[in-house]
Interface confidence: medium
Amino acid sequence: LPAQVAFTPYAPEPGSTCRLREYYDQTAQMCCSKCSPGQHAKVFCTKTSDTVCDSCEDSTYTQLWNWVPECLSCGSRCSSDQVETQACTREQNRICTCRPGWYCALSKQEGCRLCAPLRKCRPGFGVARPGTETSDVVCKPCAPGTFSNTTSSTDICRPHQICNVVAIPGNASMDAVCTSTSPTRSMAPGAVHLPQPVSTRSQHTQPTPEPSTAPSTSFLLPMGPSPPAEGSTGD
């Protein structure tokens, strides 16, 4: 005959652990049911009664199976200049991210306290390292034989076109100009763009006893442009 299935609450065998989605209650000394995501423990279990769960209230959540006495508060509302990339629901925290073309320059565990515009490399300079969610663009001077004629946070230095006969030689901020005969080799027209940083969620640990992590919430500080850095513009 198959072994009898124990229903919560039950006393575990010595040396054994509680099953999946159960926890050991130290007071009752029993294995008891956890509450599902979106719920919390309203009444803890006893030797004779199981955990009583209740739904999270508005603006609170639990992300994992848990036995927390109260749900976690969703992070602060996103500011008007931010993008809410994940709404606050009973099962997930709100996530706010810096808007496209911006990055997080000052953060705390709760999220980003300061979003700043990505540096733009001025003509004669190209992107050496693209911006990410948490780091600014790094610009570098265009090496001989390459140029950038844009003010951009994504454009890299591109090779000069090679002419049969050069009308105007290229420099760091301008492509070579060929005479009316077509060039022998030309790069694809238009600026070469680096991809914008892909949003990634940072994580921070929830207070015990729920052994889970919750995505942090980012916050935007409205601000003016950054001061120009070498090879960059704050405009």
Epitope: S59, H204, A214
Partner: antibody, heavy 120, light 111 residues
Framework: QVQLVQSGAEVKKPGASVKVSCKAS????????IDWVRQATGQGLEWMGE????????YYNEKFKGRVTMTRNKSISTAYMELSSLRSEDTAVYYC?????????????WGQGTLVTVSS | DIVLTQSPDSLAVSLGERATINCRAS??????????MHWYQQKPGQPPKLLIY???NLESGVPDRFSGSGARTDFTLTISSLQAEDVAVYYC?????????FGQGTKVEIK
């Protein structure tokens, strides 16, 4: 309007602990930090740490680590600062203050202060 | 820790005259074009009151005779025309990084 109301004055013996409360009203308590700052008589201001009531995350000044505990009760919008192993030099006025998560990033509203006297 | 040093320690100014207080940080308190330096006023028996946030922004309800300027490590609080009610101790404070720190304070009196 934003208001922070602190608990009353305390007299403690060296080695004891003190727990000061700070009840917030007029804004969403879980949205912004509560900072704790102390000021000894005739002295300057000293930041002790802060708590984010939404998650309970705390940030302590290393000087007070191991002696200070900051907690909150969301249901009554109240933050607490407990300082243990008190010594005479902990005699000071203890302030709570609100610091917005974004925007000013400064302490824009303050409690009235709680005088803690440590004396044998 | 970032150390903030205010000068002078005390200042006596005639009514209607300009008062200037300086605050120097041991390292930059700037980040991406923002200066995380703030100024507070404290009168006897009262908690501090925020006057200026992020170096130059006037807090709501604060008279416009108060102004702030500066960047990186050097900051200034100016009272353009001192009034009797401005007698107080003024503190600078940085919130660029933990632990947040305050200057030692500057006492402003009437000459």
């Amino acid at each position: 309007q934003v208001q922070l109301v602190q608990s009353g004055a305390e007299v403690k013996k060296p080695g004891a602990s003190v727990k000061v409360s700070c009840k917030a009203s007029g804004y969403t308590f879980t949205d912004d930090y509560i900072d704790w700052v102390r000021q000894a008589t005739g002295q300057g201001l000293e930041w002790m740490g802060e708590i984010y009531p939404g998650s309970g995350n705390t940030y302590y000044n290393e000087k007070f680590k191991g002696r200070v505990t900051m907690t909150r009760n969301k249901s009554i919008s109240t933050a607490y600062m407990e300082l243990s192993s008190l010594r005479s030099e902990d005699t000071a006025v203890y302030y709570c203050a609100r610091s917005q998560v974004y925007g000013k990033i400064a302490m824009d509203h303050w409690g009235q202060g709680t005088l803690v006297t440590v004396s044998s | 820790d970032i150390v903030l040093t205010q000068s002078p320690d005390s200042l006596a100014v005639s009514l209607g005259e300009r008062a200037t207080i300086n605050c120097r940080a041991s390292e930059s308190v700037d980040n991406s074009g923002n200066s995380f330096m703030h100024w507070y006023q404290q009168k006897p028996g009262q908690p501090p009151k925020l006057l200026i946030y992020r170096a130059s922004n006037l807090e709501s309800g604060v008279p416009d005779r108060f102004s702030g300027s500066g960047a990186r490590t050097d900051f200034t609080l100016t009272i353009s025309s001192l009034q009797a009610e401005d007698v107080a101790v003024y503190y600078c404070q940085q919130s660029k990084e933990d632990p947040y720190t305050f200057g030692q304070g500057t006492k402003v009196e009437i000459k």
